[in-house]
């Protein structure tokens, strides 16, 4: 007769592992016990489970409650055991020792692999601003038996360094991404992707990543300077920019306060029927945590009456 | 030839303890497991509890979690320590041993009485 058995049992940690071991024997032999052993017992082979034949399933009292006998029904000529809860103390060599009659005793070794699944976590690098150098975006890291495998899955341009530290039973790999900030990235998804034996598919945690910048300001409303004359109504002046944060506006008159009947509604200025009082330079100033800017345009409103000729100058200054 | 001789019997009060010895002497090696099996008058005898040679164990349900079988190989001792006695558990215990090979119990020590009183 043979002992029937598998080199390796592979399950994840926390799953039942079955250890088998069946005798292919002649016909008319018979298994008297098979016995249980840690073959990789610093202290030798430690017993684990001694299955016998007429007297039932004995268990060391240091696996009490995690071996029993597969559930019915039962060939008497099966010895394997099922070990619950696998923990990744558990991992290691078992050895199956059947012994029969009239041929003797046979023994056969298995290796029980523990895979212990990562957690993952993903910790965001510091503020990213525009105008940085090379900075880093997020680190990834996890811990697991065998080392899981870290990458990054995005559009964003930028470069990857891993590094991996070994423990006793487990490794932990840590990845980071670094970048050159740029406010097209801003909003862009970078997902760290874990790869793993222990898990059904790959694990993803997804940072979207926050760029600070802020645009060069600029004022629209004086394109067409013929419209700027004395009565004129609804004429205003937008002030335009972008930025991350979103930008606060301010509107101030650089030759005096804003005129009477000037209303300042967040990056607009709106004006009454227009007089020549209205005329001066006005300055937008946008500002976010990141940065300011400033943008001034000289308004002249034209008097209809007056034959001297108008003139708008536009000037940006940051 | 193995000579099994119990010891540490005698008469408790219900939910009391007692503590049984087996000392083997003779051809020990020969031991795969150790046992301890009961009789009450006018029943059939019953394994209790048994030992394997590498320390693990088996136990009748109606013992489980009250008695614990444990062994000293350095003494060539067995000892069946029982808590939480109940009447019911009023009978001869035997010491058994299975030599290597039979796998069936064929070596008896003489039996010590244990009486449970109510």
């Known amino acids: 007769g043979e002992l029937e058995t598998s080199d390796v049992v592979t399950v994840v940690l926390g799953q039942d592992a079955k250890l088998p071991c069946f005798y292919r024997g002649d016909s008319g032999e018979q298994v008297g016990q098979v016995a249980w052993a840690r073959a990789d017992a610093g202290e030798g082979a430690q017993e684990l489970a001694l299955l016998h034949s007429k007297y039932g399933l004995h268990v060391s009292p240091a696996y009490e409650g995690r071996v029993e006998q597969p559930p019915p029904p039962r060939n008497p000529l099966d010895g394997s055991v099922l070990l619950r809860n696998a923990v990744q103390a558990d991992e290691g060599e078992y050895e199956c020792r059947v012994s029969t009659f009239p041929a003797g005793s046979f023994q056969a070794r298995l290796r029980l692999r523990v895979l212990v699944p990562p957690l993952p976590s993903l910790n965001p690098g510091p503020a990213l601003e525009e105008g940085q150098g090379l900075t880093l975006a997020a680190s990834c890291t996890a811990e697991g038996s065998p080392a899981p495998s870290v990458t990054w899955d995005t559009e964003v341009k930028g470069t990857t360094s891993s590094r991996s530290f070994k423990h006793s039973r487990s490794a932990a790999v840590t990845s980071e991404f670094h970048l050159v900030p740029s406010r097209s990235m801003n909003g862009q998804p970078l997902t760290c992707v874990v790869s793993h034996p222990g898990l059904l598919q790959d694990q993803r945690i997804t940072h979207i990543l926050h760029v600070s910048f802020l645009a060069e300001a600029s004022v629209r409303g004086l394109e067409d300077q013929n419209l700027w004359h004395v009565g004129r109504e609804g004429a205003m002046l937008k002030c335009l920019s972008e930025g991350q944060p979103p930008p606060s506006y301010n509107w101030t008159r650089l030759d005096g306060p804003l005129p009477s009947g000037v209303r300042v509604d967040g990056d607009t200025l709106g004006f009454p029927p227009l007089t020549t009082e209205h005329s001066g330079i006005y300055v937008c100033h946008v500002s976010n945590e990141f940065s300011s800017r400033d943008s001034q345009v000289t308004v002249d409103v034209l008097d209809p009456q007056e034959d001297s000729g108008k003139q708008v100058d536009l000037v940006s200054a940051s | 030839e193995v000579q099994l001789v119990e010891s540490g019997g005698g008469l408790v009060q219900a939910g009391g303890s007692l503590r049984l010895s087996c000392a083997a002497s003779?051809?020990?090696?020969?031991?795969?497991?150790m046992g301890w099996y009961r009789q009450a008058p006018g029943k059939l005898r019953e394994l209790v509890a048994s030992?394997?040679?590498?320390?693990?164990?088996w136990y009748v349900d109606s013992v489980k979690g009250r008695f614990i079988i444990s062994r000293d190989s350095a003494k060539n001792t067995v000892y069946l320590q029982m808590n939480s006695l109940k009447p019911g558990d009023t009978a001869v215990y035997y010491c058994?041993?299975?030599?290597?090979?039979?796998?069936?119990?064929?070596?008896w020590g003489q039996g010590t009485q244990v009486t449970v009183s109510s």
């Open positions: 003779g051809s020990i090696f020969d031991i795969n497991l």
């Open positions: 030992i394997t040679r590498g320390g693990s164990t």
């Open positions: 058994a041993a299975e030599s290597i090979g039979s796998y069936t119990f064929d070596r």
